[in-house]
Structures are given as C-alpha cells and as structure tokens.
C-alpha cells in the first residue's frame, strides 16, 4: 500500500518553502493543479492554482505563492516565498477533474514558522533571497471551488487511518520527520 | 549500513532492453526519491530521471521518453530502471542514487549506487 | 535547458596548494548548485550542497560560494587524495544537469 505521509518543515519567518508533489504523469499531466491549506475541521481552502490547462513550467504566482507545473516530469512544485508565523499550518496538492473529486496528492506539508531569523539549519532561502523573476505573461488562475463534504478533513488522527482516494489504497501514517533545509545566506 | 547496490554488468544488442535493479538499505527505502545519473566512458554525468518510491510515480527527460521505465518493488526495497530500444551509444555506467525527501524540492544525491555497466554491442 | 559550464576542464596542481573551480550557469539559479568529487572506477560523492553547505563527513578544506549564476568550489590545501574529477549541478528547475566536470591531477 502507497502512504499517504505528512512531512513537517520548521522554516523561520522570511524564509522560503520550496516542495514539490508528483502526479501520474499520462493521466494529470495538464490537469489543472492546486494549493490548499487544511484548518482543522473545516475545508480544505484553495490558495492557488495553475492555469486550465495547466501549462508546462509555467510559473503562476499568486501573492507569495509560486507554482510551477512540469508536465514533462509529473511534478508540481511550490513555492511559498517571504513566510509569515501566520503562514503555519496544513497543506496539500490536489488535482482539479471535475465533476469528480478533487485528486490528492503526495505528501502533505506540515508547515511550522517561527519568529526571528537564524543562521541554524531550516530552510532553502532567506528573505534577502526572496526576489524571484517571474515572467511578465503571469497570470492569476481562476480556482474553483469545491464543496464536497469528502474533501472536509479533520486533523491527522494520532493513530494510523485509513484514507480512500480514487486510484490508490492509502494510509495515513503519523509525522516521523521533520525537515530543516539549509539556510541560504 | 546505508547504502545502494545495484545489479551486476549487462551486455546487450542493439535493439534490446536491459532492467537494473537498486536495492535500498538502511534507511526508509519509500521517505527519499530514486534518481537515475548516467555516464558514458570516458564522459560526464547525465541526468535520467526520478522515481517516488511511495507513490511510484516517476518522470524522466525528454531525451529518454519513451524509452526508460522506472518502477520499484517497496516490499524489497527495490528500484529499477528498464531502457529499451538500446544503441551503441547507451553503453555507460549507469548509477542510482538517493535524493532529498520525497516532498522536497531538494534535488542533491547524497547516496550512490557503485554503478551497472551496460554495453551495447552487435 | 540550464547549461552549467566549469573552467577550467582540468588543472594540475600540488599537493597544499590552494584550488578553485568555476562553475557559471546559463541562467540565474539562485543557491540551488551542489558540487561532487568522482574518483576513477567510483560513484560520484556528494561535498557541497545548496552552493556552500558542507555535506556532512566532508572535510573542511572543501568550501563552496556563489549564487546566481556565479559559482565557485575551493580546495584550501589539497590532500593526495583529493586528485578526482569534479562536478558542479544545478536544481532550480528541471531537468537537472552537470557540468561538463574538471579532472585535477598532480602536477
């Protein structure tokens, strides 16, 4: 079976998260992709997304958050630039196929920013760093926005648990790393 | 130990296929993408592709579409890479080798196989 | 593509000399550069990571600096074993590649 794990980063605040989510390429190469955060109890809430089709290496930058498609390599990448203490929480990729579900993907993000910058291991880029050159031709994309009480989730339960999605057998396994990137003066 | 061993030297004919293994060790063989580099005698490194894997979702580049295939086996904490169709000028040394976290966009590799020699000759 | 091009190609050089190699990339790749050492018959080893980190139970002569598209990797006094071939590669986006590699020898 696929786990479906939650990867925990301690940035500090102005620092940059840099992950990426992989997709099966032949189905969701130019599917329309997504940023989400997830507060407990309520619904997943989109922060952004890739154009419709989504566009091969295309960078779409909605406020501090920068996604990048690579059809080519099934990866979705994403950045969150200038982090904020407010910025901790949740987050996941999701693939857009209406009308059906939205599609999960791999690894949920834990998120976890602190105050104050230091020289110590925890992230790729400081703010000084921040100033990324995205095309002129960069477009918000227009999300949509999905209601179904399936997407609700709840916070990562303590114990395993299992997890439907469309093409997998899933399970949901408890955090077992944290993840400090070095910081880039 | 942690480390990475990889399936002994193939001699191939145009045309044909050839399957390397990697077997992952000490370490969460499904936490850290599979990368394959490769590197023609007496030449540079080359880049293949990548491999989750968890999800065993894999992507390569343009110039092996097609043509290379990276699957894995995560209850033997096995990764292979199938290319097909070879040419004389895919005979090199072909290395496996760890990257970041799965979810990282961390693309150093700080684990390396020893290399599979593949030559191909009619 | 992001072409990644070290000078120079090979160097000869002694034994505590201090070493330096170039690294320039095509476009601006912001720290996203790891450098690696390869000796004949062996696998590459990974020495510097995200430009100027050094990976762990590498030696402290090696240091690396740059950023953009400007890179450098230096060798502070070079040990016997340090004559190999090394690499620069880039991650900022994909596909990842090397550069074209420097052989050291001993002069």
């Known amino acids: 079976a696929t786990k479906l794990t939650e990867e925990k980063y301690e940035l500090k605040e102005g620092q940059t998260l840099d992950v990426k989510c992989d997709y099966t390429l032949e189905k969701f190469a130019s599917s329309q992709k997504a940023w989400q955060i997830i507060r407990d109890g309520e619904m997943p809430k989109t922060l952004a997304c890739t154009e419709r089709p989504s566009k091969n290496s295309h960078p779409v930058q909605v406020g501090r958050i920068i996604l990048e498609d690579y059809h080519d390599h099934g990866l979705l990448r994403v950045r969150m630039v200038n982090l904020q203490v407010e910025d901790s929480g949740l987050y996941q990729c999701v693939i857009y196929q209406p009308p059906k579900e939205p599609h999960m993907l791999f690894d949920r993000i834990r998120l976890v920013v602190t105050k104050g910058f230091s020289g110590t291991p925890g992230s790729n880029e400081n703010s000084t760093q921040n100033v990324y050159k995205i095309p002129p031709t960069t477009t918000k994309a227009l999300c949509p926005l999905y209601t179904s009480p399936r997407t609700v989730t709840q916070a990562p339960p303590k114990s395993t648990a299992d997890v439907s999605t469309p093409d997998s057998e899933i399970n949901l396994t408890n955090v077992t790393d944290i993840i400090r990137v070095p910081v880039f003066n | 130990q942690v480390q990475l061993v990889q399936s002994g030297a193939e001699v191939k004919k145009p045309g044909a296929s050839v399957k390397v293994s990697c077997k992952a060790s000490?370490?969460?063989?499904?936490?850290?993408?599979i990368n394959w580099v490769r590197q023609a005698p007496g030449q540079g490194l080359e880049w293949m592709g990548w491999?989750?894997?968890?999800?065993?979702?894999?992507g390569s580049v343009q110039k092996f579409r097609g043509r290379v295939t990276m699957t894995r086996d995560t209850s033997i904490h096995i990764a292979y890479m199938e290319l097909s169709s070879l040419r004389s000028e895919d005979t090199a040394v072909y290395y496996c080798?760890?990257?970041?976290?799965?979810?990282?966009?961390?693309?150093?590799?700080?684990?390396w196989g020893r290399g599979t020699l593949v030559t191909v000759s009619s | 593509d992001i072409q990644m091009t070290q000078s120079p190609s090979s160097l000869s050089a002694s034994v505590g000399d201090r070493v330096t190699i170039t690294c320039q990339a095509s476009?601006?790749?912001?720290?996203?550069l790891n450098w690696y050492q390869q000796k004949p018959g062996k696998a590459p080893k990974l020495l510097i990571y995200?430009?100027?980190n050094l990976e762990t139970g590498v030696p402290s002569r090696f240091s690396g600096s740059g950023s953009g598209t400007d890179f450098t990797f230096t060798i502070s006094s070079l040990q016997p074993e340090d004559f190999a071939t090394y690499y620069c590669q880039h991650y900022a986006n994909l596909p990842i590649t090397f550069g074209q590699g420097t052989r050291l020898e001993i002069k």
């Open positions: 000490g370490y969460t063989f499904t936490r850290y993408d």
């Open positions: 995200d430009a100027a």
């Open positions: 476009q601006d790749i912001r720290k996203h």
């Open positions: 491999m989750n894997p968890n999800s065993g979702n894999s």
């Open positions: 080798a760890r990257g970041g976290y799965t979810s990282s966009w961390r693309w150093y590799f700080d684990l």
